[in-house]
């Protein structure tokens, strides 16, 4: 489902390119904002977000934020411009095609965040560093 408020297509008047000079089209991302989650103590999780959005701007990337405190676990999925901080953190992994979670220091909670630049890449969030690999056998495990 493509929510109308973020459904965009290629803006031919303002070409955005990546660091390699390749044209960047608006990204498809999971976009459910903040939802309660059952993702805990797993190497990878699916977002369980049913909304796939076309990001408003070509420079935006997919972002996922996993938070756990004494009361609940939440997963946030959005589009965001990597030139701007998100939750006060720089999106340093925005060029990655996969969403590899990195822990960030936040008082009173466990806070992980990832960003990525392939379509719907924030649907599959990866916590275990061993999954950040080009090994096809491991990819099969991730995407079962």
């Amino acid at each position: 489902t493509i929510p109308p408020h973020v459904q965009k297509s290629v803006n031919n008047d303002m070409i955005v390119t990546d660091n390699n000079g390749a044209v960047k089209f608006p990204q498809l991302c999971k976009f459910c904002d903040v939802r309660f989650s059952t993702c805990d103590n797993q190497k990878s999780c699916m977002s369980n977000c049913s909304i796939t959005s076309i990001c408003e701007k070509p420079q935006e990337v997919c972002v996922a934020v996993w938070r756990k405190n004494d009361e609940n676990i939440t997963l946030e999925t959005v589009c965001h411009d990597p030139k701007l901080p998100y939750h006060d953190f720089i999106l340093e992994d925005a060029a990655s095609p996969k969403c590899i979670m990195k822990e960030k220091k936040k008082p009173g909670e466990t806070f992980f965040m990832c960003s990525c630049s392939s379509d719907e890449c924030n649907d599959n969030i990866i916590f275990s560093e061993e999954y950040n690999t080009s090994n096809p056998d491991l990819l099969l495990v991730i995407f079962q």
Partner: antibody
Framework: QVQLVESGGGLVEPGGSLRLSCAAS????????MSWVRQAPGKGLEWVGR??????????DFAAPVKGRFTISRDDSKNTLYLQMNSLKTEDTAVYYC???????WGQGTLVTVSS | DIQMTQSPSSLSASVGDRVTITCRAS??????LNWYQQKPGKAPKLLIY???SLQSGVPSRFSGSGSGTDFTLTISSLQPEDFATYYC?????????FGQGTKVEIK
């Protein structure tokens, strides 16, 4: 410069097979979902199917009329999208467009004619 | 699958005329509706997305409205380059389906 260039169209007999290719350039092909849309001569537009990124498993979806006969694949190392068409029927005759899924970018199309 | 029905299937109009094309979905698609223009031998071009948002570079004489099941594309003052075939498309669910098209011809 962004380009989507289809090739592989031509004349084929009913029941035959054909493989279309779409060579992409100017953008990071591996990052995007891709689709095929077709248009029979003098008729309207019909979505054929899509393939998601290899990073997310490369899942495919198809329109009912082609399900089980057509397959979509991608070779990210060659920046190429493929449409394998088997058990072709006369009603599959159309111009086939390669498109950046859900975004307004299309190739020029390649004509497939199924006729005896 | 969601069926999209356009009307009329063709129309004749003169330069300067106001032209209205309608599109009806077989079930509610909220505002998940796109309008394309296609000229002979060319790939389609997106005019309107999300029912009423004008695609970048498209002249302001094109406008879209509607939500739910009923949608309208309006050309406020038809220009010579607007003679073409127009398609609606829903992007609410897979497969994304098109209307059968409306051909706008010169009267």
């Amino acid at each position: 410069q962004v380009q989507l260039v289809e090739s592989g169209g031509g004349l084929v007999e009913p029941g035959g097979s054909l493989r279309l290719s779409c060579a992409a350039s100017g953008f990071t092909f591996s990052n995007y979902w891709m689709s095929w849309v077709r248009q029979a001569p003098g008729k309207g537009l019909e979505w054929v199917g899509r393939i998601k990124t290899t990073y997310s498993g490369g899942a495919t979806d198809f329109a009912a009329p082609v399900k089980g006969r057509f397959t979509i694949s991608r070779d990210d190392s060659k920046n190429t999208l493929y449409l394998q068409m088997n058990s072709l029927k006369t009603e599959d005759t159309a111009v086939y467009y390669c498109t950046l899924d859900l975004r307004d970018y299309w190739g020029q199309g390649t004509l497939v004619t199924v006729s005896s | 699958d969601i069926q999209m029905t356009q009307s009329p299937s063709s129309l004749s109009a003169s330069v300067g005329d106001r032209v209205t094309i309608t599109c009806r979905a077989s079930q509610s698609i909220s505002s998940y509706l796109n309008w394309y223009q296609q000229k002979p031998g060319k790939a389609p071009k997106l005019l309107i997305y999300a029912a009423s948002s004008l695609q970048s570079g498209v002249p302001s004489r094109f406008s879209g409205s509607g939500s739910g099941t009923d949608f309208t594309l309006t050309i406020s003052s038809l220009q010579p380059e607007d003679f073409a075939t127009y398609y609606c498309q829903q992007s609410y669910s897979t497969p994304p389906t098109f209307g059968q098209g409306t051909k706008v011809e010169i009267k």
